[in-house]
Interface confidence: medium
């Protein structure tokens, strides 16, 4: 048995409500992107900004599919492409193994009801490995930088939260019971958990780079929309079979 | 629901033109290939014509190249078939069909998953 | 005459299980292009019944399974009931014709 993609009809759960009839959801993609030869990379696209349904995502590069993932059908990947694409994580791809004739560029095509089609483009630029390398040098100091800032920032956040929580909490003890349930159910499908084979019913990790372009409140909508997908996607959503 | 509702088949002469309509509801038209399929009476299925999504791409039956012209206009949420120069060998009923995806290369992987209810064309003096 | 070839006819008896064949070549169904099987019951339209080679929609029932292997595909039917006598078509598309094909059809009867 094979389960919906809960994440495709989640995508719009968290959007407000906004004029129908005209096209206002935007693609955020991991835009320019470079990997090493024979490394693997996840392609990821998001969708927001829009109430519509999503019904299906493809994959394609220049003019070749790659991968579909359809809300009652489920993942398909391209038989040319299966040895070295995996679905996910969430609507985006795994490539692997990658070679240099994999630089160029990739699409994700979001199919919606009623807006229709929108497309992310991002450019992938294989790297021969010692040049890939080269460019690591220069990347690592950053990202331990960014990573530092982060884990300082996070602390400080979490020590605020803490207290403050720690306060509320000598005063509502129900509440806390309550919260303490709704965490117990987010566990059972947080963005790390497995879905079930072949599904594409996982949570969508925020693609790379998403967070520092974005305002903070919307990162914190991202955040908040994978808490609700987290336990709501404990509901029935089996609408697929498949044969083997 | 997804639904599709073909109209304009009816009794036309040989040599005459007849335009079918196939008007789309419940789904992102704009989203999807679509094909016309016939079936003539006691025969089986016959492909004749698909468009890509967007229109850019159409594609015929041989037996139909030439004479038949598939059109969309998304705007509408309709597909039409354009029928010209019409024989005998025409009569059946027509199909419209979706096909499981869009997108913008992949139409001929994915078969069609809907089908309207039909309309029927006949083509005799 | 049609580019996939099927039986004309088959027919089973209530909980048997009937196979129906369907052979093409090298630029359809030996391709990598998928074979999709619709059911075309009496007097309606066709319905899709099996995509992607091998797999169901939803709502359609576990006794219906499919397969391919080289340039031939064949739908099996297995405790076969008397609903499900109809006919059967395997449909690809065919990169020599740039066309979509389908099989002549095949009437399942149900005795």
């Known amino acids: 048995m094979r389960w919906c993609l809960l994440l495709i009809w989640a995508q719009g759960l968290r959007q407000a409500p906004l004029a129908s009839g005209m096209m206002t959801g935007t693609i955020e993609t991991t835009g320019n992107i470079s990997a090493e030869k024979g490394g693997s990379i996840i392609l990821q696209c998001h969708l927001s900004s829009t109430t519509a349904q999503v019904t299906q995502v493809n994959w394609e590069q220049q003019d070749q599919l790659l991968a579909i993932c359809n809300a009652d059908l489920g993942w398909h990947i391209s038989p040319s492409f299966k040895d070295r694409v995996a679905p996910g994580p969430g609507l985006g791809l795994t490539l692997q193994s990658l070679t240099v004739n994999d630089t160029g560029e990739y699409f994700c095509i979001y199919h919606t009801y009623p807006d229709g089609t929108y497309t992310g483009r991002i450019f992938l630029e294989v790297l021969e490995s010692s040049v890939a390398e080269h460019g690591a040098r220069f990347q690592i100091p950053l990202l331990g930088a960014m990573a530092a800032t982060l884990v300082v920032i996070c602390t400080a956040v979490i020590v605020v939260v803490a207290l403050t929580r720690k306060k509320k909490a000598l005063r509502i003890h129900s509440v806390e019971g309550d919260l303490r349930r709704k965490s117990a159910g987010q566990e059972e499908w947080s963005p790390s958990a497995p879905s079930p084979p072949g599904s594409c019913v996982q949570a969508e990790a925020a693609p790379a780079g998403l967070c520092g372009e974005q305002r903070g409140e919307d990162c914190a909508e991202l955040h908040d929309y994978f808490n609700v997908l987290s336990y709501r996607s404990l509901g029935n959503c089996s609408f697929f079979t498949e044969t083997g | 629901e997804v639904q599709l509702l073909e109209s304009g088949g009816g009794l036309v002469q040989p040599g005459g033109s007849l335009r079918l309509s196939c008007a789309a509801s419940g789904f992102t038209f704009t989203s999807y290939a679509m094909s016309w399929v016939r079936q003539a009476p006691g025969k089986g299925l016959e492909w004749v014509a698909g468009i890509s999504y967007i229109g850019r791409n159409e594609y015929y039956a041989d037996s139909v190249k030439g004479r038949l012209t598939i059109s969309r206009d998304n705007s509408k949420n309709t597909l039409y078939l354009q029928m010209n120069n019409l024989r005998a060998e025409d009569t059946a009923i027509y199909y419209c069909?979706?096909?499981?995806?869009?997108?913008?290369?992949?139409?001929?992987?994915?078969?069609?998953?809907?089908w309207g209810q039909g309309t029927t064309v006949t083509v005799s003096s | 005459q049609s580019v996939l070839t099927q039986p004309p006819s088959a027919s089973g008896t209530p909980g048997q299980r009937v196979t129906i064949s369907c052979s093409g070549s090298?630029?359809?169904?030996?391709?990598?292009?998928?074979v999709h099987w619709y059911q075309q019951l009496p007097g309606t339209a066709p319905k899709l019944l099996i995509y992607f080679d091998s797999q169901r929609p939803s709502g359609v029932p576990d006794r219906f399974s499919a397969s391919k292997s080289g340039t031939s595909a064949s739908l099996a039917i297995s405790g076969l009931q008397s609903e499900d006598e109809a006919d059967y078509y395997c449909?690809?598309?065919?990169?020599?014709?740039?066309?979509?094909?389908f099989g002549g059809g095949t009437k399942l009867t149900v005795l």
């Open positions: 449909a690809t598309w065919d990169d020599s014709l740039s066309a979509w094909v």
């Open positions: 069909a979706k096909h499981l995806t869009g997108g913008t290369t992949d139409y001929y992987y994915y078969g069609m998953d809907v």
């Open positions: 090298t630029s359809n169904i030996g391709t990598s292009r998928y």
